[in-house]
Interface confidence: low
């Protein structure tokens, strides 16, 4: 067991937020400004984020975690980590890559991102058209004759938006 | 009413350049840090680099930071862009913004214009 001990690697007892330093006989020493180390025993530590440019930061950068960065108001992340920041658009349009473009008759976005998507087709479920539909909301489905029995729910209520970050980009 | 709007762009070789322009009208151009940002093919938008009102303060994004300068010319109303050593991750869409003049330097911008595409291919 000693023997095992004294063939340990030194620099597997770094904490993390400190670097394993080679040019100090293998001392732990900390990891510099605006650096960080997560995990104990690391050689370097990592160059933290930095949230520039249409990127925010959402938590400092600190000597055991990396820098978290959001989108400036106006925009919204994608990718992991929130790799890239897109444009916000209003209700009731779509980012193209022409910008901004309101959604087309027939389909809707209760969203300031994601896609235009279609109006329910009531009569499919053998519904009418309760209320129409806009750029900005579904269209509510009104009861099928069926649904007017004493007892029933007269109106079907549209359809729960998707999450944010579900809708397809 | 603002108005904003690029040109310059076009087909260039890798290594080629190029200059963008973005004319400003229906405002006090020389009130306003402006700024370039672009959105590559199916990608999010980038902020590429900005300067102050009077083009004493500039930045860059580190992917364009030695290649790209920012100008402008306050008594012409314009904003310009010089690309230098293009690539081919350079071809984007790139749109000149006007920052919201509450916050300037802050990158939360409040009028785009319509963009013009660079891209980069030999």
């Known amino acids: 067991f000693e023997r095992t001990r004294s063939l340990q690697d030194p620099c597997s007892n770094c904490p993390a937020g400190t670097f394993c330093d080679n040019n100090r006989n293998q001392i732990c020493s900390p990891c510099p400004p605006n650096s960080f180390s997560s995990a104990g025993g690391q050689r370097t530590c990592d160059i933290c984020r930095q949230c520039k440019g249409v990127f925010r930061t959402r938590k400092e950068c600190s000597s055991t975690s990396n820098a978290e960065c959001d989108c400036t108001p106006g925009f919204h992340c994608l990718g992991a980590g929130c790799s890239m920041c897109e444009q916000d658009c209003k209700q009731g349009q779509e980012l193209t890559k022409k910008g901004c473009k309101d959604c087309c008759f027939g389909t809707f976005n209760d969203q300031k991102r994601g896609i235009c998507r279609p109006w329910t087709n009531c009569s499919l479920d053998g519904k009418s058209v309760l209320v129409n539909g806009t750029k900005e909301r579904d269209v509510v489905c009104g009861p099928s004759p069926a649904d007017l029995s004493p007892g029933a729910s007269s109106v079907t209520p549209p359809a729960p938006a998707r999450e944010p970050g579900h809708s397809p980009q | 009413e603002v108005q904003l709007v690029e040109s310059g762009g076009g087909l260039v070789k890798p290594g080629g350049s190029l200059r963008l322009s973005c004319a400003a009208s229906?405002?006090?151009?020389?009130?306003?840090?402006m700024s370039w940002i672009r959105q590559a093919p199916g990608k999010g938008l980038e902020w590429v680099s900005h300067i102050s009102s009077s083009g004493s303060t500039i930045d860059y994004a580190d992917s364009v930071k030695g290649r790209f300068t920012i100008s402008r010319d306050n008594a012409k109303n314009s904003l310009y862009l010089q690309m230098n050593s293009l690539r081919a991750e350079d071809t984007a869409v790139y749109y000149c913004?006007?920052?919201?003049?509450?916050?300037?330097?802050?990158?939360?911008?409040?009028?785009w214009g319509q963009g013009t595409l660079v891209t980069v291919s030999s």
């Open positions: 229906g405002f006090t151009f020389s009130d306003y840090y």
């Open positions: 913004a006007r920052e919201d003049p509450r916050m300037p330097g802050t990158f939360d911008f409040d009028n």
